[in-house]
């Protein structure tokens, strides 16, 4: 029996084990937060899966997504939501100690999807583990982007008081207008419920005096959150490594001088 | 045309207090960071402040902090800068200038200045 | 006294090449870009050079700017009579956390 003909993609595959990998992380994810333990793990694996499977992987839309967000809704008290952009792994380390403040990795649909690809065929149940469409190469309407496209949306949307950005000062766009949180989260945020957006740009590894704030990408990024009606402030973080050792332990000495 | 007028300066006993006013037009006022920078009668320029967009960021030179408050009114093209506590070597002309677009620190248009005296 | 020092004065003849010289430190010159403004007396200052090296449209090239370590300069060549004028190199300085100007360059064309 000849093999049956497989569109190939420019990206990686489905992440192998998608299926036991997504129901896994539902199980402990509902395990471990209690406000989330009336979901039911099955239909959340149903939800995700019927966004894309036998569905043409460069034709997915948010709307594919909407039964699984459903299923997802989870709400973030006010001052608490952690945006990033391009600094996901300081980022995580923060709200890992800092456990009451929440970046979308850190609810239920980010943490099933985080560092996960998939994507499916045309009329087929089938999960292509070989190739899946790249953003750039083959459609930006794949299964994964539009998945982290409307979550991220969502994220946004529902986010209330102070917001904070962590924002990575080592690139030469510190604010990206084509990253999810240029593009996607900053225009979603609600002027009726958000009051400000506090940005921290993380100096990269040698220690220096500029200040990141005045940074062209800044100044945009103020300029396009100020005519929403949003405040903006705005933080160097200028030693990381510090900073993180100043949330474990704020009663620190040297914790009193800046970071 | 690109324009910044100041007014507000004159003459003031030591201790009293004065308030600046810098009218922008020709250019989306609401776009850029803006600043205060002065010169005492001979000497060189000093910066002063400087205020963000939205004016959640302010900075002020040690010399001032404390008495000098830097606002803006974006719906209204203004840029302020509320002078108390004055002293002596506040004497100066005053300019108000706007940052230079897609840059950090540069200010690429002053107004003509407005001249602040203090004495008794 | 400034954070960054500048020569009091320069001088030059017409169509000579003349060099002013700033000078800071690590928390501002080293780090952070530096700036040059020309101020003729009487009137308001005018941008030069922004980002170090970098001139306006409108500021002719034969005025340049360059930076190396913890010192700035700015040259203009072929000399005019209306180059006459105090020239500032300007900057952030990290340590005080604001922006800094030198104490001027007062160019006489002779």
């Known amino acids: 029996v000849l093999p049956r003909w497989r569109q190939q993609w420019s990206g990686s595959g489905t992440t192998s084990r998608f299926p036991e990998t997504v129901l896994a992380r539902c199980v402990k994810y509902t395990e471990v937060h209690p406000e989330m333990r009336h979901v039911d793990c099955q239909s959340v694996w149903d939800a995700f899966k019927g966004a894309f499977i036998s569905k043409y992987p460069c034709n997915i839309t948010e709307e594919d997504y909407q039964p699984l967000v459903k299923l997802g809704t989870q709400t973030v008290p006010c001052n608490k939501t952690l945006l990033w952009s391009r600094i996901k792994d300081l980022a995580h380390q923060f709200t890992q100690v800092q456990r009451d403040m929440f970046t979308l990795e850190d609810m239920l649909l980010g943490y099933l999807a985080d560092d996960l690809t998939w994507c499916g065929e045309f009329n087929t149940f089938e999960i292509n583990y070989q190739s899946c469409p790249d953003w750039r190469k083959d459609c930006s309407n794949n299964p994964v982007s539009v998945f982290w496209k409307t979550v991220s949306r969502r994220f946004a949307e529902t986010a209330c008081g102070v917001v904070h950005v962590m924002l990575n000062g080592s690139r030469s766009k510190i604010f990206d207008k084509n990253s999810t949180f240029g593009s996607v989260e900053v225009h979603n945020l609600q002027p009726e419920k958000v009051q400000a957006l506090e940005a921290w740009v993380i100096h990269g590894g040698r220690e220096d005096s500029r200040d990141l704030c005045q940074d062209p990408t800044i100044k945009e990024l103020e300029s396009i959150i100020s005519k929403r009606n949003i405040r903006f402030f705005c933080k160097n973080i200028y030693r990381p490594d510090k900073f993180l050792q100043c949330v474990k332990n704020p009663e620190d000495s040297s914790c009193l001088s800046g970071i | 045309e690109v324009q910044l007028l100041e007014s507000g300066g004159g003459l003031v006993q030591p201790g009293g207090s004065l308030r600046l006013s810098c009218a922008a037009s020709?250019?989306?006022?609401?776009?850029?960071?803006m600043n205060w920078v002065r010169q005492a009668p001979g000497k060189g320029l000093e910066w002063v402040s400087t205020i963000s967009i939205s004016g959640g960021i302010i900075y002020y030179a040690d010399s001032v902090k404390g008495r000098f408050t830097i606002s803006r009114d974006n719906s209204k093209n203004t840029l302020y800068l509320q002078m108390n506590s004055l002293r002596a070597e506040d004497t100066a002309v005053y300019y108000c200038?706007?940052?230079?677009?897609?840059?950090?620190?540069?200010?690429?248009?002053w107004g003509q200045g407005t001249t602040v005296t203090v004495s008794s | 006294q400034s954070v960054l020092t500048q020569p009091p004065s320069a001088s030059g003849t017409p169509g000579q090449r003349v060099t002013i010289s700033c000078s800071g430190s690590t928390s501002n010159i080293r780090d952070n870009y530096v700036y040059w403004y020309q101020q003729v007396p009487g009137t308001a200052p005018k941008l030069l050079i922004y980002k170090d090296d970098q001139r306006p449209s409108g500021v002719p090239d034969r005025f340049s700017g360059s930076k190396s370590g913890t010192s700035a300069s700015l040259a203009i060549s072929g000399l005019q009579s209306d180059d006459e004028a105090d020239y500032y190199c300007a900057t952030w300085d990290g340590s005080l956390n604001g922006r800094v100007f030198g104490g001027g360059t007062k160019l006489t064309v002779l």
């Open positions: 200038a706007k940052d230079n677009w897609n840059d950090y620190y540069g200010m690429d248009v």
């Open positions: 020709g250019f989306t006022f609401s776009d850029y960071w």
